[in-house]
Amino acid sequence: SIPWNLERITPPRYRADEYQPPDGGSLVEVYLLDTSIQSDHREIEGRVMVTDFENVPEEDGTRFHRQASKCDSHGTHLAGVVSGRDAGVAKGASMRSLRVLNCQGKGTVSGTLIGLEFIRKSQLVQPVGPLVVLLPLAGGYSRVLNAACQRLARAGVVLVTAAGNFRDDACLYSPASAPEVITVGATNAQDQPVTLGTLGTNFGRCVDLFAPGEDIIGASSDCSTCFVSQSGTSQAAAHVAGIAAMMLSAEPELTLAELRQRLIHFSAKDVINEAWFPEDQRVLTPNLVAALPPSTHGAGWQLFCRTVWSAHSGPTRMATAVARCAPDEELLSCSSFSRSGKRRGERMEAQGGKLVCRAHNAFGGEGVYAIARCCLLPQANCSVHTAPPAEASMGTRVHCHQQGHVLTGCSSHWEVEDLGTHKPPVLRPRGQPNQCVGHREASIHASCCHAPGLECKVKEHGIPAPQEQVTVACEEGWTLTGCSALPGTSHVLGAYAVDNTCVVRSRDVSTTGSTSEGAVTAVAICCRSRHLAQASQELQ
Amino acid sequence: QEDEDGDYEELVLALRSEEDGLAEAPEHGTTATFHRCAKDPWRLPGTYVVVLKEETHLSQSERTARRLQAQAARRGYLTKILHVFHGLLPGFLVKMSGDLLELALKLPHVDYIEEDSSVFAQ
């Protein structure tokens, strides 16, 4: 008898007739930038403080009738979803509301900027515990709004935003496109993407995860005890803001990078029917539905990793695409993908003192994506070892030669346009797992890391006959850090990580002869970090 | 630049004409860029966020805003500074004619200018 959305985000161990997970986010303050709200609604009375901040445009239309309950509708519902007594996610969280949307639900980029500045100034004047900022709004792509979000995130604030309700690529909207913001798409009770009239939830690489966003019961501003069902990516974002408040209340020292990784880690995986998304967006859209962690503590010192896709490079011959990790994350591997199969591989390179993953388009190619594997690896010391193209027919190889360094990822990059079209595959010699192997025409890049308690192993899955997709997964307790194809023959479209599985995609089988050339091997590098206690002993 | 410390609200008419040239040369030869919303119905022309370079101080932001007003006034344009940003991004929000964008982009410390646009509840 509890609302479906609360049941969906609750791990089975908490489920009963009631929704009462431990600690309701009481150490966290959630800022809501939205419409005005009805603060005396019984769901939120005493837990939402209405600030004096208001920056809204005038309503459109000369005959617009301002009705208080309609003006408050959107914000009241979202405040209820985040922290409502009876139908809220983080029942203990306190909230502060800023009015940046008018009675028609419309605001401006400038008003939102001034609101974000107000939050930053409040934070400086009176530092409190962890802050979560919920932005249940969207406009067109805005460099300045994204920049402001970046600055606020770097000041330690967690920003959560709606992906947008335009059934479109979320990267075309702000603040959804800001990398530092946690961007949330909406799913329904059947774990399907939400359709809203002729439109629906946004999707794509700028979405971090999905959350319940259809028929969400929450506080209605129609009366102080009323409830109403609303739908949208705002409702989905409110769920994630609530979950974030719960996590931060349990572990107040979590950084944004740690929080994002945990949100991804504890999400339900592969439950969304991807057929709803446009075909070209399916691989880019995370198949994740947010959930609370099974226990507020005990995530411990697991190795958390996520996959970050770059923007598309575009089709020009020398076009490149770059994928970046967040400031607190380590780039442990780099791969690339092209729908046409025409690419010149990828490499890890330093940019502004940090490693990035760069993929290279090839002549006649429609463009490439770079795919970074970004991980939380405290006290890590990582470097890239490169072997230039080899003269020998054995192929190019590179390994981690520094004491205590382990291989976390392999990349290969070549200058020639049609690498390996008529060449047999190069196989890794047995008994040498700590090295990357590739074609003699390619330069090979090994990501080598040293971190307390870090151990890695290589896992391969080869299929002799051609197949459109070959996968290899890391077993329980191990985390996928590297994903690549062996060999880099021309019919391989690329490799990428989906959760803990390495996926190698090849061209349509019908266009490839079933010769030995069709053989594809997916290579996963699986790592784990032994318990922090052991790690600290190693350091001594 | 000597005119940077002037009180432009009081000295609009007294400014020497040659100072115009000083103000219009951007620093370090970098060109500030202009951005606007790709979705036409969401654009709000007439209001602009002028974003200044990262290390710009509040006093410089205020001076740059006053300088824009002064130069606009000499060209017969009214402008209104709606807000001066500091704390997150240095810059200011200005209500002005789009005709002044070229002028504004040449002001010192300017990184980029973005036309205001609408956001919507989702």
């Epitope: 509890i2 007739d17 929704y19 007594r85 009876d86 139908a87 019961i217 129609d222 009366c223 409830f227 | -």
Partner: antibody
Framework: QLQLQESGPGLVKPSETLSLTCTVS??????????WGWIRQPPGKGLEWIGS???????YYNPSLKSRVTISVDTSKNQFSLKLSSVTAADTAVYYC??????????????????WGQGTLVTVSS | EIVLTQSPATLSLSPGERATLSCRAS??????LAWYQQKPGQAPRLLIY???NRATGIPARFSGSGSGTDFTLTISSLEPEDFAVYYC????????FGGGTKVEIK
């Protein structure tokens, strides 16, 4: 069929605390579908809502009585109780307990007081 | 606080007659208004909710209308058991009750 029954002392001295309990039968106070409320009626006068409570512990009270009221739900005994402190003669009334749909589960029915207990008269006198 | 004013205070009618009771709110309560019936020595009973919906088991002779600030309870043909006190209640902003209208036998 759901029934509610109020119980508690019929006489309370001024400045003391009035304590009443409502026992629920034919239903559960642990349901997320309902709030459990108290309403009072001074002799010959109209009705006044005192406050309501939810199984999870959330409560809300009439602002005019808020400083003196505590309502709690005891799921183990399937009952809920009212405590009203610092009573005066003006608190003499028939006290009713009633169920109210929380609105969280829309199918549970209208968001009003229904059913009610039969009421218990509490007199405040020394 | 929203104040509900009921009129008349007393309504003297005979069985079979039509009874019209009024409830006026000090500010709009939209349609968030209910009517209760209370007989001597008994608890109130919900008759009409959300201005015009009959509660379970309530005879069709009872009907409610109105929205905003003005509401009416109509008993189309009074039965002997209908003589009682009737209260309106709003939930637009917390809960308040009207002072009541007593329907007595003429």
């Amino acid at each position: 069929q759901l029934q509610l029954q109020e119980s508690g002392p019929g006489l309370v001295k001024p400045s003391e605390t009035l304590s009443l309990t409502c026992t629920v039968s034919g239903g559960s106070v642990s349901s997320s579908s309902y709030y459990w409320g108290w309403i009072r009626q001074p002799p010959g006068k109209g009705l006044e809502w005192i406050g309501s409570a939810y199984y999870s512990g959330s409560t809300y009270y009439n602002p005019s009585l808020k400083s003196r009221v505590t309502i709690s739900v005891d799921t183990s005994k399937n009952q809920f109780s009212l405590k009203l402190s610092s009573v005066t003669a003006a608190d003499t009334a028939v006290y009713y307990c009633a169920r109210e749909n929380s609105g969280v589960v829309p199918a549970a029915g209208p968001n009003w007081f229904d059913p009610w207990g039969q009421g218990t008269l509490v007199t405040v006198s020394s | 606080e929203i104040v509900l004013t009921q009129s008349p205070a007393t309504l003297s009618l005979s069985p079979g007659e039509r009874a019209t009771l009024s409830c006026r709110a000090s500010q709009s309560v939209s349609s968030y208004l209910a009517w209760y019936q209370q007989k001597p020595g008994q608890a109130p009973r919900l008759l009409i909710y959300d201005a015009s919906n009959r509660a379970t088991g309530i005879p069709a002779r009872f009907s409610g209308s109105g929205s905003g600030t003005d509401f009416t309870l109509t008993i189309s043909s009074l039965e002997p058991e209908d003589f009682a006190v009737y209260y309106c209640q709003q939930r637009r902003n917390w809960f308040t009750f009207g002072g009541g209208t007593k329907v007595e036998i003429k």
